[in-house]
């Protein structure tokens, strides 16, 4: 018996087609993805093949103006229209709190939404009961397939799930649910979830009875053969893990932003064992036409967005590189721009001793969610900025000891190379890392811009000195694992809305051209 699994993950509000780098579509003939194009391909496969499941592995929420305005209603509407069979909750589904998940998505979705390792407690338990499930048994042709969901246990550090949801260890929570499916005589089980490729592989290895793992969160691109676009494969598709009980378990993920549709064919024997698995992500490029009816619907919903934020704020004459491939690995000029805007927004000429009260900015690279292409006449709109900074946070002022900052920069690279969000972009700081050293001892130079000076210059960080730093409220609250900031900050004053800070700066400057200028170096 053959099953076709179509899958998406980390779509992040890319309902409309995008440029190749998943930013706003500029040249339509070269654009990719979007729900209208996705629907065309899905329907084509549904017509051609008998047993098809369309699954999403989380993080539909957050990323563009679509989410800023519609707050999840757009996710429910268009996923319903595409007739998704199931979705796993991602960490970003909690960005507007539990209420921002329940009403727009959980209540409106006509497909099951899953997570086995999220347990509700207190008054929320009865309210959310039945709105998401640990697993769902789906009829597919003459057979049934069990889908069991999971969500990153790091979600409380990454989003706003509140105090009444407990995120358990994925493997510990999944095993009893899979066992339950087995007692219900379900012998074909897919783990669908949002914890990242490393955890996906662990689930495949450790959870007895899971036949296939469909993941998300790490934006992992897997491909067999020559990849069709810019993404470099992290491994073959499917990635085969040998489980502890000796089975070959295919693990898949489909990059992010709706650029690809994961396509996996699984052959099961009569006892539900995987005999073979093969496939590849399908690049949703302009060779695939956008479905006219979904496109018309997108255009109808689009009207409200146009009203919201299409005025030009200023111009850029350089590419603003906000790609995760840059900002999570090295100094990126989008990070520099944002940090410069953050400092500019906090210029307060206090007295003759200080040119300013604060000179430093840190910004988690994972908080930069999109680049901006200068080839669109250089125009920068609020809408462009909302894609870069979609979280609706604030840029806050904190006071920290030098020793805390040193810990923060060690944390920035403690697991360097995994495309994780904690890699810091900076302003008023020069940092040098040596990655050959062990984690926790990789910062070899950390110089900071003086404030008590008439001519600003860089001096070595003093461990016992107290410094003022501008940073996102996300970091002040210990997000992305920066617990040391939350635990050790001496003062915290909340600041202005992130997009507003950057938009004001761009409006003030009129034309911008941020460079990569050696703020972050590797020895």
């Amino acid at each position: 018996w053959e099953l076709t699994i179509l899958h998406t993950n980390d779509v992040h509000s890319r309902l409309e087609q995008t440029s190749e780098d998943s930013s706003k579509c500029v040249n339509a003939s070269r654009c990719m993805g979007g729900v209208a194009r996705l629907f065309t391909k899905v329907q084509q496969i549904r017509r051609a093949e008998p047993n098809v499941l369309l699954l999403d592995a989380g993080d539909q929420y957050q990323g563009t103006i679509w989410f800023t305005v519609y707050k999840g209603a757009e996710v429910a509407h268009f996923m319903n229209a595409l007739r998704y069979d199931a979705m796993a909750l991602g960490n970003h589904e909690f960005d507007n709190g539990v209420e921002g998940l329940i009403e727009p998505l959980l209540k409106e979705a006509k497909f099951p939404i899953l997570s086995a390792n999220i347990k509700a407690k207190g008054p929320l338990a009865s309210q959310i009961s039945g709105l998401y499930l640990p697993y769902k048994v789906l009829p597919v042709g003459d057979e049934v397939v069990g889908i069991v969901g999971y969500t990153s246990k790091e979600t409380p550090f990454l989003s706003n799930p509140g105090t009444n949801l407990v995120f358990e260890d994925e493997i510990t929570a999944l095993q009893p649910e899979v066992d339950k499916l087995k007692t219900l005589n379900v012998n074909k089980i897919i783990a669908l979830g949002h914890s990242g490729f490393e955890t996906d592989k662990l689930i495949a290895q450790k959870v007895r009875g899971v036949d296939v793992v469909v993941g998300g969160h790490s934006n992992t691109f897997l491909y067999t053969g020559n990849p069709p676009s810019k993404e470099v494969p992290a491994g073959k598709y499917p990635f085969i893990v040998t489980s502890d009980d000796g089975r070959k378990v295919p693990v898949v993920q489909a990059y992010a932003f709706g650029k690809y549709l994961g396509y996996l064919k699984i052959e099961f024997d009569e006892r539900g064992n995987v005999i073979s698995s093969h496939g590849n992500p399908i690049l949703l490029n302009s060779s695939i036409p956008e479905d006219p009816s979904i496109k018309a619907d997108i255009n109808k919903w689009r009207i409200k967005l146009d009203n919201y934020s299409t005025q030009e704020l200023g111009k850029t004459i350089v590419y603003l590189d906000g790609s995760s491939q840059s900002c999570r690995f090295r100094e990126c000029n989008m990070g520099n721009l944002i940090c410069d805007a953050m400092i500019n927004n906090n210029l307060r000429h206090a007295d003759e001793m200080f040119w300013n009260h604060v000179s430093m900015c840190i910004l988690n690279g994972g908080g930069i969610r999109s680049p901006i292409d200068e080839r669109n006449n250089g125009t920068i709109t609020w809408e462009n900025l909302a894609a870069v900074l979609p979280f609706g946070g604030t840029f806050d002022l904190v006071q920290l000891k030098g020793s805390t900052l040193k810990k923060a920069f060690e944390h920035s690279v403690h697991r360097y190379g995994q495309s994780t969000g904690e890699f810091l972009q900076v302003g008023g700081i020069h940092v040098v890392y040596d990655l050959s050293r062990k984690p926790g001892d990789r910062v070899v130079k950390l110089d900071v811009l003086c404030t008590k000076c008439r001519v600003p210059s860089y001096d070595p960080l003093k461990m016992d000195e107290i410094y003022k730093v501008i940073l996102p409220n996300f970091l002040a609250n210990g997000g992305d694992g920066f617990q040391m900031i939350k635990d050790e900050l001496l003062r915290h004053d909340s600041g202005d809305q992130d997009i507003n800070v950057v938009s004001t700066y761009i409006s003030k400057m009129k034309v911008i051209y941020p460079a990569v200028e050696g703020r972050i170096k590797f020895s």
């Epitope: 209540k107 709105l131 919903w301 409200k304």
Partner: antibody, heavy 123, light 108 residues
Framework: EVQLVESGGGLVQPGRSLRLSCAAS????????MHWVRQAPGKGLEWVSG????????GYADSVKGRFTISRDNAKNSLYLQMNSLRAEDTAFYYC????????????????WGQGTLVTVSS | DIQMTQSPSTLSASVGDRVTITCRAS??????LAWYQQKPGKAPKLLIY???SLESGVPSRFSGSGSGTEFTLTISSLQPDDFATYYC??????????FGQGTRLEIK
């Protein structure tokens, strides 16, 4: 201030038609689902029909299905109910009501109501 | 369709009393329930949504509770203005909306 003003009610013979209108003001009309709810004299409330903000989800009570048609004109901030093949049991006050949350595909609760228009079906 | 049953149909009480009206759903509706107050010759007025959320401008003596199939509306200390008819309404996902038959709260 949110205002909903119904019009078009009156006395009509069984089997005939009537069109009710609701003029909305004081809120962003095209962000919300809208509804018609009726109440027969001395009786309880009965939901008649609803239409989502984007008009993609239209629903009717079984008692009016196939006879009544709900529609909206977002440009005119107006909601309509076309009532055909009217019966004596359709006699009621008809209220126009605004749905609570914005941009929803399904229906919720009614946070604003008009004062109602009386439809009497009698020979 | 989901049936909503209110009890009692009529309730006699005095100013200052604590009163409770019950609403039962024929199947689980999570907490997708609203309560309305209606006075003679007037349109209904929303009091509570999502079973327990108080609509802005509604006095805090009104409260709602329950989930699944059993819900209650409580008025902690009855005021003269509260004598009216009260309706519950379910709005479970993609089900036709249905109301309870109403509870008339009258002066004892």
């Amino acid at each position: 201030e949110v205002q909903l003003v119904e019009s078009g009610g009156g006395l009509v013979q069984p089997g005939r038609s009537l069109r009710l209108s609701c003029a909305a003001s004081g809120f962003s009309f095209d962000d919300y689902a809208m509804h018609w709810v009726r109440q027969a004299p001395g009786k309880g409330l009965e939901w008649v029909s609803g239409i989502s903000w984007h008009s993609d989800n239209i629903g009717y009570a079984d008692s009016v299905k196939g006879r009544f048609t709900i529609s909206r004109d977002n440009a005119k901030n107006s909601l309509y109910l076309q009532m055909n093949s009217l019966r004596a049991e359709d006699t009621a006050f008809y209220y126009c009501a605004k749905d609570g949350p914005r941009y929803r595909g399904s229906y919720y609760y009614f946070d604003y109501w008009g004062q109602g228009t009386l439809v009497t079906v009698s020979s | 369709d989901i049936q909503m049953t209110q009890s009692p149909s009529t309730l006699s009480a005095s100013v200052g009393d604590r009163v409770t009206i019950t609403c039962r759903a024929s199947q689980s509706i999570s907490n997708w329930l609203a309560w309305y107050q209606q006075k003679p010759g007037k349109a209904p007025k929303l009091l509570i949504y999502k079973a327990s959320s108080l609509e802005s401008g509604v006095p805090s003596r009104f409260s709602g509770s329950g989930s699944g199939t059993e819900f209650t509306l409580t008025i902690s200390s009855l005021q003269p203005d509260d004598f009216a008819t009260y309706y519950c309404q379910q709005y479970n996902s993609y089900s036709p909306i249905t109301f309870g038959q109403g509870t008339r709260l009258e002066i004892k």
